[in-house]
């Protein structure tokens, strides 16, 4: 969490941002809140990016003002206009790309004063893994697949029964570049699995951590997966 305060002159206002991650090829949110004002026409929101000459986005007098917008953000940005009055200056970014990563500044002017806060925005790819029993294999084998990751993640297997065991000798992980030549498909195979056990396939890079669990019994197979972003630090 980054909390910024205003600059000299007028009173300062508190602006709060949260470091976040964008999944390339999807819309992303750059989070920013501020002390609200009672009059929308008195609020100015400016989003800036380090190393970019033009503005990322500007909202003033109750509407978008995009005449100074940088070309790389043209057609891609929006604030939540109906939520500005309650102090939400968050930015929606369409079709996040790797090049969108960097340091952004959320700069606010209201009748109460000015304030700003920086935000570190990471971009990459992350997806939910799916773990299945590989019936084509000669021995009991599990196959963990996740369609899109970047940067290249690490893959670690764990089991409920053999807690703390190292499965690197009985697993094999491969990374296959996807057609857009950025993200990769992750495939990890675990050999010699035993029945009545729960296995977890954990995929992690510096942006996200995802886990796919599978419980194999003689009568059924149960699966569960979840994904967690790692860098949600507020400022």
């Amino acid at each position: 969490l980054i909390i910024g305060f205003g600059i000299s002159g007028r009173h300062s206002i508190t602006v709060t941002t949260v470091a976040s991650a964008g999944n390339i090829g999807e819309d992303g949110i750059l989070s920013c809140t501020f002390e609200p004002d009672i009059k929308l026409s008195d609020i100015v929101i400016q989003w800036l990016k380090e190393g970019v000459l033009g503005l990322v986005h500007e909202f003033k007098e109750g509407k978008d003002e995009l005449s100074e917008q940088d070309e790389m953000f043209r057609g891609r940005t929006a604030v939540f206009a109906d939520q500005v009055i309650v102090g939400n200056a968050s930015l929606r970014l369409k079709n996040v790309q790797l090049t969108d990563a960097g340091t952004y500044k959320c700069y606010i002017i209201t009748s109460k004063g000015k304030g700003n806060a920086n935000l570190e925005y990471k971009t990459g790819a992350f997806s939910m893994p799916e773990v299945n029993v590989d019936y084509n294999a000669s021995s009991e084998t599990l196959r963990c697949e996740a369609p899109r990751w970047f940067p290249q993640p690490t893959v670690v297997w764990a089991s409920q029964v053999d807690q703390g065991a190292n499965f690197s000798e009985v697993s094999n992980t491969s990374f296959e570049l996807n057609s857009e030549n950025v993200t990769m498909k992750v495939v990890s195979v675990l050999y010699n699995v035993t029945i009545n056990n729960t296995y977890s396939c954990m995929i992690e890079n510096d942006i996200a951590k995802a886990t796919g669990d599978i419980k194999v019994t003689e009568s059924e197979i149960k699966r569960r997966s979840h994904l967690q972003l790692l860098n949600s630090k507020a400022s």
Partner: antibody, heavy 116, light 109 residues
């Protein structure tokens, strides 16, 4: 040259299924938001579905649960699987690329007629 | 659900005249996500304006877009014979994700 070419349209009975294809050239489908938009005879444009670069999909309420958008990255082709077709699905179906600057590339359209 | 309402439904003008087409949204739309298209009979739509006011590649400068919030305008400063067509506005980002207006038919008077 950047181009989209649709195929797969035709005459189909109510309740039937059809798969539309949209072959792309000059750009990579999986890097863009790819859409299907339709136009009923004498009517306006209606958005049908989108698949994001990530593979996430969204649908108009009128087709949700019946239509499925997908792509084959190796063939650089977009698809629309249409099941449980109704008379009101009769339209020209266009695929269109959203390259952040709006729907900037459109196919020529393929006609779907649902009639008994 | 966001609704885009275009007016007038039909606009009858002569070549050389100025055309003003309106698109009104039922709730606020980001200027970045507002586009205009032209469609001629038997053809696919063509992108004219994106980001409410930026001309797409190859679009003549007699076409201009303006507006913000809920009110957007497409202006054709001096009508050419090839400009007579149907025009649609379109938004992105609300529910449904993409929405088109019902269209304005620009016809020769």
């Amino acid at each position: 040259e950047v181009q989209l070419v649709e195929s797969g349209g035709g005459l189909i009975q109510p309740g039937g299924s059809l798969r539309l294809s949209c072959a792309a050239s000059g750009f990579i489908v999986s890097r863009n938001y790819m859409n299907w938009v339709r136009q009923a005879p004498g009517k306006g444009l209606e958005w049908v579905s989108v698949i994001y670069g990530s593979g996430r999909t969204y649908y108009a309420d009128s087709v949700k649960g019946r239509f499925t958008i997908s792509r084959d990255n190796s063939k650089n082709t977009l698809y629309l699987q249409m099941n449980s077709l109704r008379a009101e699905d009769t339209a020209v179906y266009y695929c269109a690329r959203d390259a952040d600057y709006g729907l900037d590339v459109w196919g020529q359209g393929t006609t779907v007629t649902v009639s008994s | 659900e966001i609704v885009l309402t275009q007016s007038p439904g039909t606009l009858s003008l002569s070549p050389g005249e100025r055309a003003t087409l309106s698109c009104r949204a039922s709730q606020s739309v980001s200027s970045s996500y507002l586009a205009w298209y032209q469609q001629k009979p038997g053809q696919a739509p063509r992108l004219l304006i994106y980001g409410a006011s930026s001309r797409a590649t190859g679009i003549p400068d007699r076409f201009s877009g303006s507006g913000s919030g809920t009110d957007f305008t497409l202006t054709i400063s001096r009508l050419e014979p090839e400009d007579f067509a149907v025009y649609y506005c379109q938004q992105y980002g609300s529910s449904p994700l993409y929405t088109f207006g019902q269209g304005t038919k620009l016809e020769i008077k």
